[in-house]
Amino acid sequence: IFKKEQAMCLEKIQRANELMGFNDSSPGCPGMWDNITCWKPAHVGEMVLVSCPELFRIFNPDQVWETETIGESDFGDSNSLDLSDMGVVSRNCTEDGWSEPFPHYFDACGFDEYESET
């Protein structure tokens, strides 16, 4: 399941790069798969929010990106996530790259990267 989600994630990142005009030399944070969920590309100063993944959900390749961004740009018809919701994790895109997830997955979602590897 996670291999499939990772593959879908990479496809989604590629589509997002095209839509947002991102390339390897663009400033900002590249989209990434962090072994738990998929993070879309982001501009410096953007905060990206994601919902805790449903660990055993089969990814739907046609679904919209399940994130909400705060900053210069939004992507697609994203869900209206808010840090005041439970089960939401954020990362900031900084000049040094992505920040650590906050809260950590283990405290926001009840599981961590080690569980997703098994």
Partner: antibody, heavy 123, light 107 residues
Amino acid sequence: QVQLQQSGPGLVKPSQTLSLTCAISGDSVSSNSATWNWIRQSPSRKLEWLGRTYYRSKWSNHYAVSVKSRITINPDTSKSQFSLQLNSVTPEDTAVYYCARGTWKQLWFLDHWGQGTLVTVSS
Amino acid sequence: DIQMTQSPSSLSASVGDRITITCRASQSISRYLNWYQQKPGKAPKLLIYAASSLQSGIPSRFSGSGSGTDFTLTINSLQPEDFATYFCQQSYSPPFTFGEGTKVDIK
């Protein structure tokens, strides 16, 4: 029914190491759905979370910054128990120490606690 | 660290009263908040988790509400066994800090 039974000395000399053990019955320290925590309560009644250990394919520990340089929480899978070691204690470490199980249901909460051990740091 | 501020620090009430205890977080913690009751010489006991969910076995006169930074614990029709100290605790991000406690005693 989950029960946590604490053991360890009630008096520790300054600069020495505080060691307490929490024996688990009705659950396993290797459970992949629980965390195992230590909390203390100072004489002023203030509760302070010290840290936790848990198993998810591998063992992980999280510690409070206030004690991070001095604390170790170790699981003992053979006895289904976990321990607290706090090094270089001072009288400010005098407190009632509790072990507790963390359970996940939308968030982590502490649903089963040990009976508490009063530890006095004094020469 | 996230600071948890509880008020009042103590209150006096009578059996049958409705009381409210408040807890404020130094930053938004969504609903990652728990309430515990502690009686002298005993360990804390979980009452409410996720701000408003009643722990199994806890009487329905206990209720919790709130989200973000402001939370309340309400006890409807206070019973003799409810005279105790109450603590809030955030589990949004370690270290999982507690409020200073509210002692409820008999008027």
